[in-house]
Interface confidence: low
């Protein structure tokens, strides 16, 4: 009956008239649909030109509403980042500023003429904590070998000590162990501590930028094909009310996100070794209790060089032989001022628990986030039919859908009936991202086994030894320059989007 | 001592296919990633493929995309090249390549620059 | 690919260095050395991971990265380093790169 064909029409007209398309364009009652490429080629209320429109339309639309879920997620793990980088770089500097009011009173020349040294560790932390390629291990070890000159050069102003007595001090200071326990406490909890922050919002930058880079990854000709199928053809085809059988929807976006669904191993894999190493952050050797009270540790080093100057000259002269006294300068120092130690223990904040619970609970929310795209796209952006099962929307008509639903990834879609996948080329940015998901994972397996992976068997003589416990007090029989305090290799591996001086991202 | 046997090079035909294997020894092959790398007479190194430890990875260089196969048997402790459609550019010596860093405890990349050990190399002529 | 000197000469007991750049630039740059002392002959790693030596180099051959440089320095060079050495990194999609290597002769 025409009339009733010319009725449907009008629906059509409305709907693509509201999608901001001429109307001049529509037919006013249904014509032939030979011409039609994607629609079944029954009666149609579309032309040639309106399948191609809406085809596009469908698609940028897809492409839209999988923007908006990557973005929710991206925010989220953005805010953590933010959130746990300004804790840690909190703690880091709390501990600098303690240490600034505190040692002049305590220790008196003995810190003030090595502020820049002190300053200079603080700042080699932080740059290690964003990011940069140093090594941990070497930078407290150069510090602690370049304090050890300086202070016994104060404490023995009559002394003359020129570089060769200096260089014998050095290979003598392993042995002897001046600074007491503490560098060496100090190295094995920084080292754990250190490693596991920076790893850990290392690892959500990369998850943030891995769903950033997905999110841009082009809908292929194959999916616009089957989501103009989904959502459009209904109008095409008379029968405009009926809305996408759940199943068929669920096909359709399984096959357009094959790629994506691959992600999912790895991704969780990411998340389970984020949440596992946040277990890190407690108890003494906690990023907490580490970062937060490095200054403790400076202080007892101080106190311990002092305790032991006498015994330590005594070695030192017996090792390197008499130094000359020095006719200008004065008499020993006599005066000691000890430190008095803060409590190495600070107190927990409640902020870090907080953060962490918080983060747990976001990141095993999302753990899923790439296989449930479908389901949650068909759901929430779809008016999927809940009539009874023969009365929704198919492909072809109004009747029951009844292929199964695709397993994920894209290896389970070799007989998806909606979208022709070509299983044997995975998609290479999506590739690309599950490396960087699977590096990222590497990074922070070895940081909760406390190694930093960048360093593990970089040790000077090039034997394989794993990442070296060698130094009993953290001063290795090395040369250290006196030159400089700080010459040290520029940021390579920086935390994406945080830094100024970024180096380079992770990406 | 570690040790790296590669076998099948030889005379190849043009348009022929190319199939080799290396054979390891000396060191838990299952945790390491594996490269062939090549050189043409009278030239610099190029890396052709490779391929990471439990094989979820693989690369190829530019000249080979699409007509090379890198592939590993763990239980063999063997790798395989196959190079299809072959040409008088592939001639030169191949080398098969490991690394130290496993992707289990990784140094964090998949570069030419992780290679710590070499094998002696097999001939490849292609005419 | 990756940019290395074509050839560089030294005096028995001089220090070498031989630079490189190019590498993949997502923050994970590992470069290595390879020593090939004559064409067909196998290459022989003198450092990999930027800093790592094998157990049977000798300690002159280091290695260190600044920023997006490779550097090689042989301290103490002896006539048997007269080789072409290259350098190997990646580039950004993860495929591996070599240098067109550098001559040196001593």
């Known amino acids: 009956d025409p009339a009733s064909k010319s009725r449907s029409c009008g629906e059509v007209r409305q709907i693509y008239g509201a999608k901001g398309f001429s109307l001049s364009d529509v037919p006013q009652a249904e014509i032939s649909g030979e011409h039609l490429r994607i629609c079944p080629q029954g009666y149609t209320c579309c032309t040639s030109e309106m399948e191609e429109n809406l085809a596009n339309r469908s698609h940028a639309e897809l492409e839209t509403a999988l923007r908006d879920s990557s973005r929710v997620l991206q925010a989220m793990l953005a805010t953590q980042l933010r959130s746990f980088d300004d804790h840690f770089q909190h703690l880091l500097n709390d501990s600098e500023r303690t240490l600034q009011a505190t040692f002049p009173g305590a220790f008196g020349e003995l810190y003030t003429q090595n502020a820049r040294a002190f300053r200079d560790l603080y700042s080699e932390l932080r740059l290690y904590y964003r990011g940069a390629n140093l090594h941990l291990e070497e930078t407290l070890a150069e510090f602690w070998a370049r304090l050890l000159e300086r202070l016994f050069k104060q404490l023995h102003p009559q002394l003359l000590l020129p570089d060769d007595y200096l260089d014998c001090l050095g290979k003598q200071a392993e042995a002897l162990r001046p600074f007491g326990e503490a560098p060496r406490e100090l190295r094995l909890r920084a080292t754990r501590a250190f490693v596991a922050a920076r790893s850990f919002v290392q690892g959500l930058g990369v998850a943030s930028d891995v769903v950033r880079k997905v999110a841009q990854v082009p809908l292929g000709p194959e999916c616009s094909r089957a989501v103009m199928k989904l959502v459009y053809c209904a109008h095409c085809l008379g029968v405009p009310g009926a809305r996408p059988c759940p199943d068929y929807c669920r096909n359709v976006l399984k096959g357009c996100l094959a790629n994506q669904a691959d992600l999912d191993a790895e991704w969780r894999n990411l998340l389970d070794s984020m949440v596992l190493i946040t277990d890190k952050f407690w108890g003494t050797s906690g990023v907490e209790s580490v970062i937060g009270s490095v200054h403790t540790w400076l202080a007892e080093a101080i106190n311990a060089l002092q305790d032991n100057r006498d015994t330590l000259t005594a070695k030192v002269i017996q090792g390197c032989g008499n130094p000359k006294v020095n006719p200008q300068g004065p008499g020993p120092e006599e005066k000691r001022r000890r430190g008095k130690l803060a409590p190495r223990e600070r107190p927990p904040s409640g902020t870090l628990e907080k953060l962490v619970s918080e983060a747990k609970a976001q990141l095993r929310d999302v753990q899923d986030f790439w296989i449930s795209l479908p389901g949650t796209l068909c759901s929430e952006k779809m008016a999927l039919s809940t009539a009874s099962d023969d009365r929704c929307w198919n492909g072809m008509a109004r009747g029951r859908y009844l292929p199964e639903v695709m397993g994920d990834g894209l290896a389970n879609q070799i007989n998806n009936p909606e979208v022709e996948v070509d299983i044997t080329k995975p998609d290479m940015t999506i590739r690309q991202q599950i490396m960087q998901l699977k590096i990222m994972t590497n990074r922070l397996r070895s940081a909760y086994n406390g190694n930093d992976v960048d360093f593990q068997d970089a040790s000077d003589d090039g034997s394989g030894s794993g990442s070296g416990d060698g130094c009993l007090d953290d001063l290795c029989s090395r040369k250290v320059s006196r030159k400089s305090s700080s010459s040290r290799t520029p940021l390579t591996h920086a935390l994406p989007g945080l830094s100024e001086q970024e180096g380079q991202k992770t990406s | 001592a570690v040790t790296l046997d590669e076998s099948g090079g030889g005379l190849q035909t043009p348009g022929g296919t190319l199939s080799l294997v290396c054979k390891a020894s000396?060191?838990?092959?299952?945790?390491?990633?594996m490269f062939w790398v090549r050189q043409a007479p009278g030239k610099g190194l190029e890396f052709v493929a490779g391929i990471d430890n439990d094989a979820t990875f693989t690369l190829y260089g530019s000249a080979v995309k699409g007509r090379a196969s890198i592939s590993r048997d763990n239980g063999q402790s063997t790798v395989r090249l196959q190079l299809n459609n072959l040409r008088a550019e592939d001639t030169g010596t191949y080398y098969c390549?490991?690394?130290?860093?496993?992707?289990?405890w990784g140094c964090g990349a998949y570069s030419a620059g992780d290679i710590d050990a070499w094998g002696h190399g097999t001939e490849v002529t292609v005419s | 690919a990756l940019t290395q000197p074509s050839s560089v000469s030294a005096n028995p007991g001089e220090t070498v260095k031989i630079t490189c750049s190019g590498g993949g630039s997502s923050g994970y740059g590992y470069y290595g050395w390879y020593q090939q002392k004559s064409p067909g002959s196998a290459p022989v790693t003198v450092i990999y991971n930027n800093n790592k030596r094998p157990t049977d180099i000798p300690s002159r051959f280091s290695g260190a990265l600044s920023g997006s440089t490779a550097t090689l320095t042989i301290t103490g060079v002896q006539v048997e380093d007269e080789a072409v050495y290259y350098c190997g990194s990646r580039d950004n999609t993860y495929v591996g790169i070599f240098g067109a290597g550098t001559t040196l002769t001593v």
């Open positions: 000396g060191f838990d092959f299952s945790s390491v990633n």
């Open positions: 390549a490991k690394t130290l860093c496993s992707t289990t």
